[in-house]
Interface confidence: low
């Protein structure tokens, strides 16, 4: 029977800069029941706080709801593991909510084949930002990436769309069924998961000629 091993806070993520969650890996349990607590303070402030919500994020997590989340202020946090034989502390982790945003995938992905008479045909892809993101505030810039491939192909073709929420693709193989997905990331932060795939059948008369 030993004191617990050193825990490690290995990930913090926010869907929208308004809330965030951190997760830790327990160290060895020392053969005894172990309690974990996460404490934090905000850079330049005076108060030490305990994690406000150990439930929402699942096991070994701490969730910070809206009233506990401040942008532009660094959180300094550590996890304390305690059993009957003693305690151990994780290293301190510095968290700036601005840099841990991982949004939900974009929504309402729509894909259409357009065949105008006077121009080359193209695939028109359109989507909406994730619901939780408020782009009106001005301090949130989302960037988008599209990937598509014929249904049976192994390799994805990737296109960077910048801040646009629609995109045109000209070079496609006629007669093929394509899978299309989109994802987004804030200017500082992590890519979202890919959106659910949308399927589109490219007509056989879709021409790739100039």
């Amino acid at each position: 029977q030993l004191p617990p091993g050193k825990p490690e806070i290995f990930k913090c993520r926010s869907p929208n800069k308004e809330t965030f969650t951190c997760w830790w890996r327990p160290g060895t349990d020392g053969g005894l029941p172990t309690n974990y607590s996460l404490t934090y303070h905000r850079e330049g402030e005076t108060l030490m706080h305990e994690c406000p919500d150990y439930i929402t994020g699942g096991p070994n997590s701490c969730h910070f709801g809206k009233q506990y989340t401040s942008m532009w202020r660094t959180y300094i946090m550590m996890v304390n593991a305690t059993n009957q034989m003693g305690s151990s502390f994780s290293d301190e982790l510095y968290v700036d909510v601005t840099y841990i945003v991982q949004p939900d995938p974009p929504l309402e992905l729509a894909v259409e084949v357009k065949q105008p008479e006077d121009r080359k045909p193209y695939l028109w892809i359109k989507w909406s930002p994730p619901t939780l993101i408020d782009l009106k505030t001005g301090w949130f810039t989302l960037l988008y990436e599209i990937r598509l491939k014929p249904e049976k192909a192994a390799e994805w073709e990737i296109h960077f769309a910048g801040q646009q929420t629609e995109f045109k693709i000209l070079s496609l193989h006629p007669g093929q069924k394509y899978l299309v997905q989109v994802r987004c990331k804030p200017d500082h932060g992590y890519w979202s998961a890919w959106s659910p795939a949308t399927f589109i059948q490219i007509p056989s008369d879709f021409t790739m000629n100039d």
């Epitope: 303070h41 330049g44 005076t46 030490m48 300094i76």
Partner: antibody, heavy 111, light 108 residues
């Protein structure tokens, strides 16, 4: 520019009371925890009390617990320290602080 | 008597490097971050270093902080006459601030 201006210090008899104020300007007052720290003449710094941004949590040094009360009025951007049952050892310059920094210039309490 | 121990005095000549120590235990410095304050004669204390080794804007990079185990240090390089002041280490376990005893730095 952040400014903290303490007032209310003075000479008081042992057992008496004083109320210190700290007027804050130049920042969003209700974003910050605030503290009182004191310094007896020729001595080091001693933390007295602190209060959370919303006034919901207050903390005191053992030496003043039960005698001093920290409070704040966010509508007036003002921090207070009500000091009762004063003793000779409470004689000090009392500073208010925003978070860890900055500090006001202090007000002298002599018991 | 503070649980954080600082030397009562330190001294150096202009241009020298001076270090001020702050020692504690695993239950205080060992599990908390450390701040350092400078108090020039007749003025209020000023934050010099926070979270062990970070400098607030406006503090010259001649001042640096470090922490190892149960002790922390403040180093001042390129000592100047205006650095003559009292210096305090500080931690804040469980929402209570704890200051070290002061170190009076004399520039010879």
């Amino acid at each position: 520019e952040v400014q903290l201006l303490e007032s209310g210090g003075g000479l008081v008899q042992p057992g008496g009371s004083l109320r210190l104020s700290c007027a804050a300007s130049g920042f969003t007052f209700d974003d910050y925890g605030m503290s009182w720290v004191r310094q007896a003449p020729g001595k080091g710094l001693e933390w007295v009390s602190l209060i959370s941004w919303d006034g919901g949590s207050t903390y005191y040094a053992d030496s003043v617990k039960g005698r001093f009360t920290i409070s704040r009025d966010n509508s007036k951007n003002t921090l207070y320290l009500q000091m009762n049952s004063l003793r000779a050892e409470d004689t000090a310059v009392y500073y208010c602080t925003r978070g860890f920094d900055p500090w006001g210039q202090g007000t002298l309490v002599t018991v | 008597q503070s649980v954080l121990t600082q030397p009562p005095s330190a001294s150096g000549t202009p241009g020298q490097r001076v270090t001020i120590s702050c020692s504690g235990s695993s239950s205080n410095i060992g599990s908390n971050t450390v701040n350092w304050y400078q108090q020039l004669p007749g003025t209020a204390p000023k934050l010099l270093i926070y979270d062990n080794n970070k400098r607030p804007s406006g503090v010259p990079d001649r001042f640096s902080g470090s922490k190892s185990g149960t002790s922390a240090s403040l180093a001042i390089s390129g000592l100047r006459s205006e650095d003559e002041a009292d210096y305090y280490c500080m931690i804040w376990p469980s929402n209570a601030w704890v200051f070290g005893g002061r170190t009076k730095l004399t520039v010879l």
